[in-house]
Amino acid sequence: CDLPQTHSLGNRRALILLAQMGRISPFSCLKDRHDFGFPQEEFDGNQFQKAQAISVLHEMIQQTFNLFSTKDSSATWEQSLLEKFSTELNQQLNDMEACVIQEVGVEETPLMNVDSILAVKKYFQRITLYLTEKKYSPCAWEVVRAEIMRSFSLSKIFQERLRRKE
């Protein structure tokens, strides 16, 4: 399964789309910056088996897909870009699911790292809470967009490390 290679390309495409989605100047949103507590440690460890690593990445993409599939998101972002972004994420999710099924036969370790997946879920809960508290303002969405771009970039490093391990 060459997921890290295909996923890396998909990740790059998703990042480009996210970058294009900006609607307002981020310079006006500095005071809205927020610490979402990206679970860096879940993307640092080398202890993962490949299927576990993919399941953590899958959760990250799934949560991002959910976040940008809300009606509040649709009201904020340019529709065609949003659709392209969602399609890209959906393709990545499908690729990952196929890859995990392939890996399960190879590995005898548990399919999922429950603690890591919970950490990713909580991270996105903090993002959703922030958006709610900020009443889904344009600046709040701009801060979240920047945060998701950062988390994608950090997970890209994780994927590259995963590829080197193969």
Epitope: S25, F27, C29, L30, D32, A146, E147, M149, R150, S153
Partner: antibody, heavy 121, light 107 residues
């Protein structure tokens, strides 16, 4: 290793134009903004302006608006500060520094070594 | 623009002394306040960001506190290499602005 490397010292005459540079390496250049700071001889730090290299969006301090132009070329990971007509009062050390934008990360954590600009007739 | 006022503008201290520098903003800047150290002929160096977070690699004798309009940089035990000029800077809104600086000299 993250580095911001600035172009060398410049000696110019009043009325001349100038463009100084700041090249980023060791990180994703478009993921950080680049700010410019002036320090006149024996004086404090003055914030001039900032650019988001991902889309070249800029913002200036009112004191420097119209006096300088900030630009970037993301293909070569370089930001620029330029003057169309220098004055003697532009004599100063100019620093570039990176800023994490809207991300929760240290502000201006890496700085260039500075470019000394001397304007004298 | 937000004005940043540092005090004192200079101070004399001895090695081992506890040194406190204050910075006041003309309006609330939440915790978006940074502290820099600058030595002659060198670029500024980030010490503290978001008012109280210690930048990686900076000795723990440096600490920052405050929020809103009043902020403090403390050096718990001054070392020979700490003699320099210190600047505060707000990053709450553009344009970013610096304090005028505090020069820490040897007594």
């Amino acid at each position: 290793e993250v580095q911001l490397v600035q172009s060398g010292a410049e000696v110019k005459k009043p009325g001349e134009s100038l463009k100084i540079s700041c090249k980023g390496s060791g990180y994703s250049f478009t993921s950080y903004w680049i700010g410019w700071v002036r320090q006149m001889p024996g004086k404090g730090l003055e914030w001039m302006g900032i650019i988001d290299p991902s889309d070249s969006d800029t913002a200036y301090s009112p004191s420097f608006q119209g006096q300088v132009t900030i630009s970037a070329d993301k293909s070569i990971s370089t930001a620029y500060l330029q003057w169309s007509s220098l004055k003697a009062s532009d004599t100063a050390m100019y620093y570039c520094a990176r800023h994490p934008g809207l991300n929760w990360a240290p502000d201006f954590d890496y700085w260039g070594q500075g470019t000394l600009v001397t304007v004298s007739s | 623009d937000i004005q940043m006022t540092q005090s004192p503008s200079s101070l004399s201290a001895s090695v081992g002394d506890r040194v406190t520098i204050t910075c006041r903003a003309s309006q609330s800047i939440s915790k978006f306040l940074n502290w820099y150290q600058q030595k002659p002929g060198k670029a500024p160096k980030l010490l503290i960001y978001f008012a109280s977070s210690l930048q990686s690699g900076v000795p723990s004798r440096f600490s920052g506190s405050g929020s809103g309009t009043d902020f403090t940089l403390t050096i718990s035990s001054l070392q020979p290499e700490d003699f320099a000029t210190y600047y505060c800077q707000q990053s709450n809104t553009l344009p970013f602005t610096f304090g005028q600086g505090t020069k820490v000299e040897i007594k």
